[in-house]
């Protein structure tokens, strides 16, 4: 059976072979992939990038979250979604994922001119069916899914909208473990509205494998804060294997090329 | 109170290596990073690396990645860098530090070590 | 890596006069500069985190401001135990640096 794919820390840390990100297959090795760094001066503004809409982001729920031997997940369900942003059609929230390491510099998969953050949070959302525009985009869409990204840092205060979620790691420690998170709504885990207005978009993948291309990625320039303890939870409470012996940290696939694509922003 | 207490100070010759130690009491070693700094005779500040005492995770200084290793003990709560060929500019002190706030300012420092390369 | 400046090299005073630093960063670092003192023979003391928030236990009379490229660190009124050495440090972007320090000394 081949191998199934894993992160570089779990390969270095585990007796179990895997393959790494230089191996993924699939889409993995193609020329529009995913995360890149964004050089802030050169991506270009465009007036058609306008503020999101949010549906259902305000709504208290109970999420699911479950470690799926990757990261962290909530489970959405098609209980959100978001319009405007420039995007052409409206999104449906399926899940919600982080990336991070235990040290500060090197969290994020995305950076900003060459600098990484703390951590990295992902909404994906995929597209309302029957909303593209033509034929071959409907057959071939690169606009399919949608991926809020937004960078983490530490600030000096605990974010209580992201209480929830840390307190429900502990109750997920093993992969294929899930729980139920306390009442929260999406947009508390949001910055403030007014940070969401600048952003920076491009054409990419999914950051795991098979990496499809299809991904239209929304990168916010404003980082969520966090307490340190709330992101040093997530490499202390959460491991990569059932024996726990190997923390989930450095869940972060690396930079690719941005070749020939261009990076917009608002 | 919050202390880090460094080992004391040491005279070796060229070529060897040493290894420094900074003993955390009064928080909990795990939840906060520790920090390096050099100081030579006379002279600024040069931050060396970082490590996270709960995983052992580190970050270097590209300047000092072949130079400096750092290594933390959870069970006596104490840091340690060791230093690898060793020359005279190496001669300096050495101070531990806690990070804060993850990423940010050093709250509290050791009293630093003071290391001499001579022959 | 992001550049940091003091000046000047060295301030003379007098005990009970006002006295400020400054710190100039290659770029704009928000508010993310901390400072330092150091005495003679001594370790660094947090006396400024955030170019202006205070410190527990620092004396009052030690005040910071600024923000994007230029920062002040100021003492309303000079008393002798703060002959020292005061370091800027940039925590913006990895690795953190430090200015080259601006001595205080007496008169």
């Known amino acids: 059976a081949e191998s199934h794919w894993c992160y570089e820390v779990q390969a270095e840390s585990s007796n179990y072979p895997c393959l790494v990100p230089v191996k993924w297959g699939g889409n993995c090795q193609k020329d529009r992939q995913s995360p890149i760094n964004i050089v802030t001066t050169k991506a270009k503004v465009d007036k058609k990038l306008g503020r999101f809409f949010f549906s259902g982001y305000d709504k208290k729920q109970t999420w699911t979250v479950q470690n799926n031997g990757h990261s962290v997940m909530m489970l959405l369900e098609n209980k959100a979604s978001i319009s405007g942003g420039g995007l052409p059609a409206p999104y449906q929230a399926k899940q919600l994922h982080l990336h991070w390491s235990d040290l500060p510099y090197k969290g994020s998969e995305h950076s900003l001119d060459g600098e990484h953050f703390a951590m990295e949070m992902h909404i994906v959302h995929e597209k309302e069916k029957g909303t593209s525009r033509n034929v071959k985009e409907a057959q071939d869409p690169e606009d399919e899914i949608a991926v809020l990204a937004f960078l983490v840092e530490a600030g000096t205060q605990v974010n209580e909208g992201f209480q929830p979620l840390v307190e429900a790691l502990s109750n997920i420690p093993k992969p294929e473990m899930s729980t139920t998170m306390a009442e929260s709504s999406l947009l508390d885990l949001l910055p403030k509205e007014e940070k969401l207005r600048h952003y920076f978009r491009y054409l990419g993948s999914l950051t795991t494998p098979t990496c499809d291309e299809k991904v239209v990625w929304t990168v916010f320039r404003e980082p969520i804060q966090l307490h340190r303890e709330q992101i040093l939870a997530f490499s202390q409470k959460l491991y990569y294997d059932k024996e726990q012996t190997v923390s989930m940290k450095d869940n972060v696939r690396p930079l690719q090329q941005l070749g020939q694509r261009t990076v917009i922003k608002s | 109170d919050v202390q880090l207490v460094e080992s004391g100070a040491e005279l070796v010759r060229p070529g060897t290596s040493m290894k420094m130690s900074c003993k955390a009491s009064?928080?909990?070693?795990?939840?906060?990073?520790i920090e390096w700094i050099k100081q030579r005779p006379g002279q600024g500040l040069e931050w060396i690396g970082v490590?996270?005492?709960?995983?052992?995770?580190?970050h270097y200084n590209e300047k000092f990645k072949d130079k400096a290793t750092l290594t933390a003990d959870k069970s006596s709560s104490t840091a340690y860098m060791q230093l690898s060929s060793l020359t005279s500019d190496d001669s300096a002190v050495y101070f531990c530090?806690?990070?804060?706030?993850?990423?940010?300012?050093?709250?509290?420092w050791g009293q630093g070590t003071t290391l001499t390369v001579s022959s | 890596q992001i550049q940091i400046t003091q000046s000047p090299a060295i301030l003379s005073v007098s005990p009970g006069e006002r006295v400020s630093f400054s710190c100039r960063a290659s770029?704009?670092?928000?508010?993310?500069i901390h400072w330092y003192q150091q005495r003679t023979n001594g370790s660094p003391r947090l006396l400024i985190k955030?170019?202006?928030e205070s410190i527990s236990g620092i004396p009052s009379r030690f005040s910071g401001s600024g923000s994007g490229t230029d920062f002040t660190l100021s003492i309303n009124s000079v008393e002798s135990e703060d002959i020292a050495v005061y370091y800027c440090q940039q925590s913006n972007s990895w690795p953190t640096t430090f200015g080259a320090g601006t001595k205080l000394e007496l008169k």
């Open positions: 955030y170019a202006s």
């Open positions: 490590i996270n005492p709960g995983s052992g995770g580190t």
């Open positions: 530090a806690r990070e804060a706030d993850y990423g940010s300012r050093f709250d509290y």
């Open positions: 770029q704009s670092i928000g508010t993310r």
């Open positions: 009064g928080y909990a070693f795990t939840n906060y990073l």
